[in-house]
Amino acid sequence: MKVLQEPTCVSDYMSISTCEWKMNGPTNCSTELRLLYQLVFLLSEAHTCIPENNGGAGCVCHLLMDDVVSADNYTLDLWAGQQLLWKGSFKPSEHVKPRAPGNLTVHTNVSDTLLLTWSNPYPPDNYLYNHLTYAVNIWSENDPADFRIYNVTYLEPSLRIAASTLKSGISYRARVRAWAQCYNTTWSEWSPSTKWHNSYREPFEQH
């Protein structure tokens, strides 16, 4: 049994880091493998992660961490029984993938303005709470070409757009994702999408 593709890990910079790797053949990850992880600091405690299958030869492990700070560095040991298959390290702050925003809501009752709001996925005491910026994706269910991205570079988790920038009388969907420049993170996954029917009063034509 050998590791074909070494583990790569990303952290949500809160409580979970996810590591993925591939074996050289079909593997029952949960029964055959264990991923041990431990902070490098003196007398830090070792933890065991039981991996799950992620395709025939792929494995994924969700490392639970009570919290994460920029100084943290973990040693990682991948074991198959008594055999050490791979040894590496992982610094969560250098491999951050933020959590996806939640509770995306479209408020359509504000005159001819659409107000989109969502929730910051981090608690206020987390470093990323005040460092997230967002991208909002709005698209038409009827017209695949009607697809747009709005970059939200301010901290408030909301976006206002004129309803008239979208077509009236058709359904739209929206979703939002986040990233943090401070840790040069990757983008989060998209939030679940929300749907609304766009309708607004056309202004009277001037004659």
Epitope: L39, F41, L42, S44, E45, D66
Partner: antibody, heavy 118, light 111 residues
Framework: EVQLVESGGGLVRPKGSLKLSCAAS????????MNWVRQAPGKGLEWIVW??????????YYADSVKDRFTISRDDSESMLYLQMNNLKTEDTAMYYC?????????WGQGTSVTVSS | DIVLTQSPASLAVSLGQRATISCRAS??????????MHWYQQKPGQPPKLLIY???NLQSGVPARFSGSGSGTDFTLNIHPVEEEDAATYYC?????????FGGGTKLEIK
């Protein structure tokens, strides 16, 4: 919210025994190393004992000043830390703190007072 | 055992000024890119509170006027600007090896 609440302190005669308890809540107790640190009246801080988690077979380390007299133990199912103190001496008079360790001693209980006097 | 020597034993600093506390270790407490030195604040009748871990990292919830620096054997805790509520005793502590020892403490008085 992390909380550590010590109990069991009191007045005891020299050569007597006492058992201190620490109730932990607000965190995954079973994954942390835990300490007892004491502070004699008007003095500085003295680390006395450390216990690691199950993943390290509950390894223990004692300061020379308490070795062979004090015993640390833990009950992960109840999130409890204990310190059994035997053959107490007057110099053991102190406030005893239960302390969590991660990168440093990051959370401390309010302490329980032990007085050894005849 | 590693002996930690704090200086001064006490100091008085005017409100808004800088307080500097030193901690010297009898041997290096740095290894593998980390300095295993931590700083605590203790007010009368209260348990110690972690301020700085691993020499320079601010513990969550601690005001940014506290900062730590140093490596090897020499470490410093700075408080600037000092506020009334900073009156306390400050301890350094290492976790480089067993036993983890504490400095003797520095009592800070606000003038």
């Amino acid at each position: 919210e992390v909380q550590l609440v010590e109990s069991g302190g009191g007045l005891v005669r020299p050569k007597g025994s006492l058992k201190l308890s620490c109730a932990a809540s607000g965190f995954s107790f079973n994954t942390y190393a835990m300490n007892w640190v004491r502070q004699a009246p008007g003095k500085g801080l003295e680390w006395i004992v450390w216990i690691r988690s199950k993943s390290h077979n509950y390894a223990t380390y004692y300061a020379d000043s308490v070795k062979d007299r004090f015993t640390i133990s833990r009950d992960d199912s109840e999130s409890m830390l204990y310190l059994q103190m035997n053959n107490l001496k007057t110099e053991d008079t102190a406030m005893y703190y239960c302390v969590r360790h991660l990168r440093a001693m990051d959370y401390w209980g309010q302490g329980t007072s032990v007085t050894v006097s005849s | 055992d590693i002996v930690l020597t704090q200086s001064p034993a006490s100091l008085a600093v005017s409100l808004g000024q800088r307080a500097t506390i030193s901690c010297r270790a009898s041997k290096s407490v740095s290894a593998s890119g980390y300095s295993y030195m931590h700083w605590y604040q203790q007010k009368p009748g209260q348990p110690p509170k972690l301020l700085i871990y691993l020499a320079s990292n601010l513990q969550s919830g601690v005001p940014a006027r506290f900062s730590g620096s140093g490596s090897g054997t020499d470490f410093t805790l700075n408080i600037h600007p000092v506020e009334e509520e900073d009156a306390a005793t400050y301890y350094c502590q290492h976790s480089r090896e067993l036993p983890p020892t504490f400095g003797g403490g520095t009592k800070l008085e606000i003038k």
